[in-house]
């Protein structure tokens, strides 16, 4: 069976924006008014892997772009990527552990750990126009809470 | 501050091989693509490479696929350029910058020169 | 590999408007591209002046501005500045498959 898939924006708890700024680069900053045309849409895949009531493993795409968000571990930190894949072979239900990543929902905030890296996040700075990363603390300075916004198809 | 600051250059043969590197501060790295971008004597700018955060996709210009190789050190904040079988057209001052599309204060760059 | 054209040169009058364009041999201009665009004096570095179509990058003055016009990224010089005399350059992503970017040849601006 083909995957489940949505389109959706992301926004922070801070209600910042996720936007591209270059070919590999999704970063965070507010947005009003005819800008918020320019923030990402995601394409959310519901994918193989562990579940529960409040925990979903999915795969974030870019929308009519061949990139996925995906977890590596580089120079012994897991990092975030933006990585380029065949479009003729993705999305699929049993994505590589390093795409997938555990949507979990608390008090209508979601979190996205990383299903390859435990306890690490999908983070966003307090600071406006920076890099989203792969941060390893919750609670803290860094932002790894989102709310999702769905987009028609 | 942004510092990007370029070095390994030199005089090297035709088909000789170089390896530049890039010490990045005043960012976190590793959260920021990055790329090369060189510019030859009296011509405008050339894109040479770009790179990912964590290493997986890359990019090359069609003049040095193949020859050139872009990597990064993301715990040694460390940008670098593997140039193999290097041509006499490949003499230029190479700079790192910040981003694939090399949105940066660009560094002073380091001076290659392929000559017998 | 598709080739990124711009105005060989143009010229303005202190305090008059200017606009360069870049476009490419196949196809238009579109955001997916990342229009970047580029300043270099005799003897200097390049700087960048915008990135991602029409962000201002840090301590560029307001009178610089990029946006797309047609099927052409543009840089608009607003109340052109003697020191603006300079090489401009656009860059662009090239997002069909090859996954680099390329630079146009330059527009040399004088202001006189």
């Known amino acids: 069976a083909p995957v489940r898939s949505l389109n959706c924006t992301l926004r922070d708890s801070q209600q910042k924006s996720l936007v591209m700024s270059g070919p590999y680069e999704l970063k965070a900053l507010h947005l009003q008014g005819q800008d918020m045309e320019q923030q990402v849409v995601f394409s959310m895949s519901f994918v193989q892997g562990e579940e529960s009531n409040d925990k979903i493993p999915v795969a974030l795409g870019l929308k009519e772009k061949n990139l996925y968000l995906s977890c590596v571990l580089k120079d012994d930190k897991p990092t975030l990527q933006l990585e380029s894949v065949d479009p003729k072979n993705y999305p699929k239900k049993k994505m590589e552990k390093r795409f997938v990543f555990n949507k979990i929902e608390i008090n209508n905030k979601l979190e996205f750990e990383s299903a390859q890296f435990p306890n690490w996040y999908i983070s966003t700075s307090q600071a406006e126009n920076m890099p989203v990363f792969l941060g390893g603390t919750k609670g803290g300075q860094d932002i790894t809470d989102f709310t999702m916004q769905f987009v028609s198809s | 501050e942004v510092q990007l600051v370029e070095s390994g250059g030199g005089l090297v043969q035709p088909g000789g091989s170089l390896r530049l590197s890039c010490a990045a501060s005043g960012f976190t790295f590793s959260t920021y693509a990055m790329s090369w971008v060189r510019q030859a004597p009296g011509k405008g700018p050339e894109w040479v490479s770009g790179i990912n955060t964590g290493g997986g996709s890359t990019g090359y210009a069609d003049s040095v696929k193949g020859r050139f190789t872009i990597s990064r050190d993301n715990a040694k904040n460390t940008l670098y350029l593997q140039m193999n079988s290097l041509k006499p057209e490949d003499t230029a001052v190479y700079y790192c910058?910040?981003?694939?599309?090399?949105?940066?204060?660009w560094g002073q760059g380091t001076q290659v020169t392929v000559s017998s | 590999q598709a080739v990124v054209t711009q105005e060989p040169s143009l010229s303005v009058s202190p305090g008059g408007t200017v606009t360069l364009t870049c476009g490419l041999s196949s196809g238009s201009v579109t955001t997916n591209n990342y229009p970047g665009w580029f300043q270099q004096t005799p003897g200097q570095a390049p700087r960048t002046l915008i990135y991602n179509t029409n962000n201002r990058h840090s301590g560029v003055p307001s009178r610089f501005s990029g946006s797309i016009s047609g099927n052409k990224a543009a840089l608009t010089i607003t109340g052109a500045q003697p020191e603006d005399e300079a090489d401009y350059y656009c860059?662009?992503?090239?997002?069909?498959?090859?996954?680099?970017?390329?630079f146009g040849g330059g527009t040399h601006l004088t202001v006189l």
């Open positions: 910058a910040k981003d694939w599309m090399a949105t940066t204060p």
């Open positions: 860059a662009l992503y090239m997002s069909s498959g090859s996954n680099n970017a390329v």
